[in-house]
């Protein structure tokens, strides 16, 4: 049934990136107002982003309490005044969002190369450990503490004066690669969980190459 | 005429439960959100929670989340405020409201119910 | 949250003269699309439920006297009471309904100088 003159929300998309997550829907608002609710599926309806004007809903509070569970959202369109003087008192319209699970399916956001240091051919370079939404005791967790081996980085890595690129792979933070001494490279990394079947690689972090400021990857 | 009756406050130890109601006449209740405000002793109004004409959706101030569960009957015309876990900063008149022109636009207030929580 | 900003806290005003009472929210609760303020003024007498004078900043809910008015926009507002009649003194309040947990000033005494 559903109260005249609203209209269902419809396109409703999950907007995550480590674990910050937004429902996004159409359309935009007019004469009417939504309210979303979020549920694991063996748990109750809780209502987020009450009477709302706005077409996204962070839900990031809710889904880092358990990121592994699977979560459904719906949103409920209710029109824009009290039902007496707008339409009936029927089941308000509604549509649901497409499950979701944030450890499975949540973006992983660009990383960042921390520091690279060598010693004779070695290089050691390290990646930041960003920092989540999610929380354990109070303390905001990192990426590797919520993922651990499931969460691996690949380095790609070539000399400045070279566009043959090489590639190394880690399950930790730090990369120990050979290298030709005299010679200064360039490093790129990218997150990645080889055991997903979406979203298992993160764009590539910002270019870093020794002996210069941040430089760009050139084919 | 609107009228908005509420009932079930009381004085109460910390930690134990009290269940308000409010009794609404003269409109048609199952079309109106309504909410829960609270006005402690000389102090200003707070807002505690909303329900929505159907029901379904509820929110609530974070002061009341998880202790407080507002829900209504439509077939009786009554909105009820079940509070646990009671604590001294709970002592307050509450007062039930009805969703006026806009959600949130109170056109109408019960005269309210003393909810006092003391050992 | 929203947080609303009443001044003065009190007021003492000579009958027949003009109270004015501001109140500012921390973020604006103008909704561009209709261009409507979502705030709302209420009166609250001793021992009674506060009473809505005016919502959507400006607009005088049915049966309020047109000494009382509201002006605005976005995180500034003014309730003025034109002329103080005896039966005005009370505690004036403003609220936010843009967005939620809905918040109210702390409240503004008027009083009969």
């Known amino acids: 049934s559903g109260t005249t003159n609203t209209v269902a929300a419809y396109n409703l998309t999950w907007k995550s990136t480590n674990f910050k997550t937004i429902l996004e829907w159409e359309p935009k608002p007019v004469n009417q107002v939504y309210t979303v609710q979020i549920s694991t599926k063996s748990g109750d309806w809780k209502s987020k982003c009450f009477y709302t004007t706005d077409t996204e809903c962070d839900l990031t509070d809710e889904i880092v309490k358990d990121v592994k569970q699977t979560y459904l959202a719906r949103v409920f369109s209710y029109p824009a005044g009290n039902v007496e003087s707008t339409g009936s008192a029927g089941e308000p319209l509604y549509e649901n969002s497409p499950e979701f699970t944030p450890y499975l399916e949540t973006n992983l956001g660009q990383p960042t190369i921390q520091s690279f240091e060598q010693v004779g051919t070695k290089v050691n370079v390290t990646v930041e450990d960003e920092r989540t939404l999610v929380r354990k005791n109070g303390t905001f967790l990192t990426l590797r503490q919520v993922f651990g081996n499931d969460l691996g980085y690949i380095l790609t890595y070539r000399k400045s004066s070279s566009s043959g690129k090489k590639t190394a792979k880690t399950n930790t933070n730090e990369f120990l690669i050979d290298v030709d001494k005299g010679e200064n490279y360039c490093f790129s990394v990218q997150a990645v969980i080889p055991s997903r079947t979406v979203n298992r690689k993160s764009t590539d972090s910002p270019v870093e190459c020794m002996g210069q400021e941040k430089g760009e990857f050139r084919e | 005429q609107v009228q908005l009756v509420e009932s079930g406050g009381g004085v109460v130890q910390p930690g134990r439960s009290l269940r308000l109601s409010c009794a609404a006449s003269g409109f048609t209740f199952r079309s109106y959100g309504m909410h829960w405000v609270r006005q402690a002793p000389g102090k200003g109004l707070e807002w505690v929670a909303v329900?929505?004409?159907?029901?379904?959706?509820?929110y609530y101030a974070d002061s009341v989340e998880g202790r407080f569960t507002i829900s209504r009957d439509n077939s009786k015309n009554t909105l009820y405020l079940q509070m646990n876990s009671l604590r001294a900063e709970d002592t307050a008149v509450y007062y039930c409201?009805?969703?006026?022109?806009?959600?949130?636009?109170?056109?109408?207030w019960g005269q309210g119910t003393l909810v006092t929580v003391s050992s | 949250d929203i947080v609303m900003t009443q001044s003065p806290d009190s007021l003492a005003v000579s009958l027949g003269e003009r109270a004015t009472i501001n109140c500012k929210s921390s973020q604006s609760v103008l909704f561009s699309s209709n261009n409507k303020n979502y705030l709302a003024w209420y009166q609250q007498k001793p021992g009674q439920p506060p009473k809505l004078l005016i919502y959507?900043?400006?607009t005088r809910e049915s049966g309020v006297p047109d000494r009382f008015s509201g002006s605005g926009s976005g995180t500034d507002f003014t309730l003025t009471i034109s002329s103080l009649q005896a039966e005005d003194v009370a505690v004036y309040y403003c609220?936010?309904?843009?967005?939620?947990?809905?918040?109210f000033g702390g409240g503004t005494k008027v009083e009969i100088k």
């Open positions: 609220q936010q309904f843009h967005s939620y947990p809905l918040t």
């Open positions: 409201a009805r969703d006026g022109v806009y959600y949130g636009v109170y056109d109408y």
């Open positions: 959507w900043a400006s």
């Open positions: 329900i929505t004409y159907d029901g379904i959706n509820k």
